[in-house]
């Protein structure tokens, strides 16, 4: 069975910036990856990137860079100022699309030692 | 405009063979996954056959298994369905229809249909 | 396979009428659902996708909504063109599956 994975980092030199990055753990070629924030797309959640491995990437702020790492991971740096910037307990999905299969979510969030009040 | 338009279709035996056609325009064929999907007399839909925009990867329903073939010819802008050792049950309208990435793999585009009528 | 249970199977109703279609998916499809409408002889023509995003050219009175396994199609105000009928789909997982369709007639 497929599997997605997801990992998200807080990056050293900006506390409030971000980076996300999932992979498919499956044979089927990737038609699309969602990326979301605050839930599942299908939950409530908000889309920061969609990429395609043809027709590009589409991203909304507080999206700042969506990248293809390999043919089946992603990449993604989120903006780290303004209202809608993340906090430390967000959740973060990736949702990847292979057709004729369909669809497969993971979501993820920051771990516990990564809060910013525990760093030095 | 985009326009897909199925031939093929007729009157044929139990145990015979038929190969519908499905010429695409107005689009880049080669970017889409596509799709047969069949609706027998007074009945629903059903997803036949598909087949991937790089013709990696296929589905067939359970019951036409080894005895339908999807295929597809990106230089021609043309899909087919081989259809071998045809039963009664097989006898419905075809249509060929186009999967939009970003619309979740909905089907956003149809062809007008084909009869296929199995009877002795 | 995913189950798509449509409800009603058929529906009598007026013009000007609001009508509401559901579908329950017999497992978690995403947002991974569309709607179609057909009319008689005709093909299948999308309306919805995405759970709630309209189709390019489809009427404002079409609307769609739901998550998880239950999803809805409302047409807030029937027009004489909007007798047909409606399918409900799921594109979460292979096989993509309909619904049994909901027809809607004329009271």
């Known amino acids: 069975t497929p599997e997605v994975w997801v990992q998200v980092r807080m990056e050293a030199t900006e506390l409030s910036s971000f980076t996300i990055r999932c992979g498919f753990l499956g044979s089927g070629s990737i038609s699309l990856v969602t990326v979301s924030w605050g839930g599942p797309n299908g939950a409530g959640g908000t889309t920061l990137a969609v990429l395609h491995p043809e027709r590009g990437i589409r991203q909304w702020a507080p999206a700042r860079q969506a990248r293809w790492e390999t043919q089946s991971s992603i990449s993604l740096i989120l903006e780290g100022s303004g209202a809608s910037s993340p906090c430390a307990n967000t959740t973060f999905c990736c949702k990847f699309a292979s057709f004729p299969e369909g669809s497969w979510e993971a979501c993820g969030s920051l771990p516990p030692s990564s809060d910013p009040g525990l760093s030095a | 405009e985009v326009q897909l338009v199925e031939s093929g279709g007729g009157l044929v035996q139990p145990g015979g063979s038929l190969r519908l056609s499905c010429a695409a325009s107005?689009?880049?064929?080669?970017?889409?996954?596509m799709s047969w999907v069949r609706q027998a007399p007074g009945k629903g839909l059903e997803l036949v056959s598909a087949i991937n925009s790089n013709v990696i990867s296929t589905y067939y329903l359970d019951t036409v298994k080894g005895r339908f073939t999807i295929s597809r010819d990106n230089a021609k802008n043309s899909l087919y369905l081989q259809m071998n050792s045809l039963r009664a049950e097989d006898t419905a309208v075809y249509y060929c229809a186009r999967h939009e990435d970003y619309y979740g793999f909905a089907m956003d585009y149809w062809g007008q249909g084909t009869l296929v009528t199995v009877s002795s | 396979d995913i189950q798509m249970t449509q409800s009603p199977s058929s529906l009598s109703a007026s013009v000007g009428d609001r009508v509401t279609i559901t579908c329950k998916a017999s497992?978690?499809?995403?947002?991974?659902v569309a709607w179609y409408q057909q009319k008689p002889g005709k093909a299948p023509k999308l309306l919805i996708y995405y759970v709630s995003n309209r189709f390019t050219g489809v009427p404002s009175r079409f609307s769609g909504s739901g998550s998880g396994t239950d999803f809805t199609l409302t047409i807030s105000s029937l027009q004489p063109e909007d007798f047909a009928t409606y399918f409900c789909q799921q594109a979460y997982r292979s096989p993509w599956t309909f619904g049994q369709g909901t027809k809607l007639e004329i009271k």
């Open positions: 107005g689009f880049t064929f080669s970017s889409y996954h």
């Open positions: 497992q978690s499809v995403s947002n991974d």
